[in-house]
């Protein structure tokens, strides 16, 4: 099994590892499937691409019957199988079978924290946000290891790219020192940013 690892939105080339001459195409059926679902077929020269791969998949017949998937999505991750059937003695027989495992990475960048003063009060508001990752993120605010209550946390998903964005607000009393951590967990991964507030200088120091 061949393993291919790519970043989301990149291009992945999955090779069948087999060549068929133009002359042989009329007597050949090629099936690319992903986890038992069809991606692409070429039957005696007629090509058909399944709806979820249309307009973003190229079949490269000259390059080992490869499929090229453009603008990778997280849901493209999985095991692909290429089957080549050749016509011989009144039937199509399996001439070649190959498996390619595709991993699609979609890491959230380190979140950014911006702060705003709320006029005529001792309350200051900070906003933590990041976008462009997968799977669905879970954001929490921590201070001294204890979880805090955010004002509101919003998680949205782009229906086309399948990537998530997350944003959360936290209000705090600016008359005391604080060190807040914005922690985002997604799948088995995590990313965080720390915001420090120092009352003596009335300034903050985000960790980089």
């Amino acid at each position: 099994v061949i393993h291919v690892t790519k970043e989301v939105k990149e291009v992945a080339t999955l090779s069948c590892g087999h060549n068929v001459s133009v002359e042989e195409l009329a007597q050949t059926r090629i099936y690319w499937q992903k986890e038992k679902k069809m991606v692409l077929t070429m039957m005696s020269g007629d090509m058909n691409i399944w709806p979820e791969y249309k307009n973003r998949t190229i079949f490269d017949i000259t390059n080992n019957l490869s499929i090229v998937i453009l603008a990778l999505r997280p849901s493209d991750e999985g095991t692909y199988e290429c089957v080549v059937l050749k016509y011989e003695k009144d039937a199509f027989k399996r001439e070649h079978l190959a498996e390619v495992t595709l991993s699609v990475k979609a890491d959230f960048p380190t979140p950014s924290i911006s702060d705003f003063e709320i006029p005529t009060s001792n309350i200051r508001r900070i906003i933590c946000s990041t976008s462009g990752g997968f799977p669905e993120p879970h954001l929490s605010w921590l201070e001294n290891g204890e979880e805090l209550n955010a004002i509101n946390t919003t998680v949205s998903q782009d229906p086309e790219t399948e990537l998530y964005a997350v944003s959360s607000k936290l209000d705090f009393n600016m008359t005391t020192n604080h060190s807040f951590m914005c922690l985002i967990k997604y799948g088995h991964l995590r990313v965080n940013q720390t915001f420090n507030w120092n009352t003596t200088k009335q300034e903050h120091f985000p960790d980089n």
Epitope: A26, Q33, K36, M38, T41, M43, S44, G45, D46, N48, E81, V83, L85, Y87, D90, A91, F92, K93, R94, L97
Partner: antibody, heavy 114, light 108 residues
Framework: QLVQSGAEVKKPGASVKVSCKPS????????MHWVRQAPGQGLEWIGW????????LYDPKFQGKATITADTSTSTAYMELSSLRSEDTAVYYC?????????WGQGTLVTVSS | DIQMTQSPSSLSASVGDRVTITCSVS???????LHWYQQKPGKAPKPLIY???NLASGVPSRFSGSGSGTDYTLTISSLQPEDVATYYC?????????FGQGTKVEIK
Amino acid sequence: QLVQSGAEVKKPGASVKVSCKPSGFNIKDYYMHWVRQAPGQGLEWIGWIDPENGNTLYDPKFQGKATITADTSTSTAYMELSSLRSEDTAVYYCAREGLFFAYWGQGTLVTVSS
Amino acid sequence: DIQMTQSPSSLSASVGDRVTITCSVSSSISSSNLHWYQQKPGKAPKPLIYGTSNLASGVPSRFSGSGSGTDYTLTISSLQPEDVATYYCQQWSSYPLTFGQGTKVEIK
């Protein structure tokens, strides 16, 4: 060349499993297809199975209704129909993959009646 | 899905007549992927012509096929009593595989 199981009469809501056993070849080496024909109607392709690895492909119209399986140890292909309704009354044929369907089973009549 | 439209849906002709059945395909396909079958009542379909114009094994030479792209034709040059049957075209260009609705041929 392809011998199918006998006619079945089933009640609505029941399931039925039709078998197809080739003589002279092993199904492991060929994709096996199923086609149906309702009384007085035309031919409708249901789907295929690659018996070697169990991969299947269905016409979306039959997804959830038909389940195609194969047992390579007995060289037999099966098609199970679930939640039967009167509209499922038809002759069901198995056929072997080729440039075209050169080999067909004799057909199995499935009658759904209360 | 590729739609297959046959015409006529039925016809009646005399023994010795030339009979033509047409099959219109909703999108262009390779001629290698167009096939014709003959089905007699109570029997499984039998291959007649494959790849537009090739006679299947044991098929009499009075049967012929032609066409390309989206338009295909099955011709019986001299209709015989044993040709009474329903004829179907079928595409193997893309899934799901589809058949025409059938043309019933009878003797006058």
